[in-house]
């Protein structure tokens, strides 16, 4: 299945974080979502074959990239308290 790391992370305000996702083998598309406690998931990015294919309602301090092996990183800079959330990765063909 899809694997993410790290599973838990504690950061202080203003710091930067990098989250990693490995898709299901053979999947070329990776999507990232943010789920704040008590709310539904909010779409952040979709990447397909290393190109950004979709962009959610987040400013540019949220960035992502996809590597040649189709794994992906999500970076969040200048962290705010409101960034505290569950970050989900999904993959598809």
């Amino acid at each position: 299945g899809v694997t993410q790391s790290p599973t838990h992370l504690i950061k202080t305000r203003g710091q930067q974080v990098t989250l990693r996702c490995s898709p299901i083998s053979g999947h070329k598309s990776v999507s990232w979502y943010q789920q704040v406690l008590g709310q539904g998931p909010q779409f952040i990015f979709q990447y397909y074959e290393k190109e950004e294919r979709g962009r959610g309602n987040f400013p540019d301090r949220f960035s992502a990239r996809q590597f040649p092996n189709y794994s992906s990183e999500l970076n969040v800079n200048a962290l705010l308290l409101g960034d505290s959330a569950l970050y989900l990765c999904a993959s598809s063909l």
């Epitope: 962009r55 959610g56 309602n57 540019d60 301090r61």
Partner: antibody
Framework: QVQLQQSGPELVKPGASVKISCKAS????????MNWVKQRPGQGLEWIGR????????KYNGKFKGKATLTADKSSSTAYMHLSSLTSVDSAVYFC????????????WGAGTTVTVSS | DIVLTQSPASLAVSLGQRATISCRAS??????????MHWYQQKPGQPPQLLIY???NLESGIPARFSGSGSRTDFTLTINPVEADDVATFYC?????????FGSGTKLEIK
């Protein structure tokens, strides 16, 4: 070519509301974020907010929450901004502007709609 | 909110000379190797026009006389050489965080 055609000037009374439009052509309207920007006479630029026409998702500058409401009609490729409880400080030129492909910059702008609030 | 301070507020440059406009952000606007600062030109009675995106990338159709540089909090728009058609107000804009903000503008005149 990509174009954003805005509605004409509006003269409205204090306390009234107004809805201005921005009709897009030449690109995939539903999948491109639309932004709105305010410019008071002789002043600088203020970002009001953005809308994703595909699903209506919005984000507002806190300064304009309760003042501006953004909507979009996919069938006509038109974005709208409703301004309520108008006062003299709302007299301005309002621009719609499309998000660029590589970040939240604005690569195509409408010509602007002048809103004048006067009794 | 991120505050963008432009300087000078106005400048007069002779034709053929170099014009330099500064934009300073109240905090870094860099993320993952990109600087999310953009530059626009606005001529009287017209909407703004994108010149430079992500600090140093020239928008399609914009003359190479325009260039941008800088990172983190300090950014510069350079016009070299200045032409008569460049008379306008220039704005910087950050998209690093919400709400997006603009600088107060720099008015360029010909000496």
């Amino acid at each position: 070519q990509v174009q954003l055609q805005q509605s004409g000037p509006e003269l409205v009374k204090p306390g009234a509301s107004v809805k201005i439009s921005c009709k897009a052509s030449g690109y995939a309207f539903s999948s491109s974020w639309m932004n709105w920007v305010k410019q008071r006479p002789g002043q600088g630029l203020e970002w009001i907010g953005r809308i994703y026409p595909g699903d209506g998702d919005t984000k507002y500058n806190g300064k304009f929450k309760g003042k501006a409401t953004l909507t979009a009609d996919k069938s006509s490729s038109t974005a709208y901004m409703h301004l309520s409880s108008l006062t003299s400080v709302d007299s301005a030129v309002y621009f719609c502007a499309r998000r660029g492909t590589g970040g939240w910059y604005f690569d195509v702008w409408g010509a602007g709609t002048t809103v004048t609030v006067s009794s | 909110d991120i505050v963008l301070t432009q300087s000078p507020a106005s400048l007069a440059v002779s034709l053929g000379q170099r014009a330099t406009i500064s934009c300073r952000a109240s905090e870094s606007v860099d993320s993952s190797g990109n600087s999310f600062m953009h530059w626009y030109q606005q001529k009287p009675g017209q909407p703004p026009q994108l010149l430079i995106y992500r600090a140093s990338n020239l928008e399609s159709g914009i003359p190479a006389r325009f260039s941008g540089s800088g990172s983190r909090t300090d950014f510069t728009l350079t016009i070299n050489p200045v032409e008569a058609d460049d008379v306008a107000t220039f704005y910087c804009q950050q998209s690093f965080d919400d709400p997006f903000t603009f600088g107060s503008g720099t008015k360029l005149e010909i000496k």
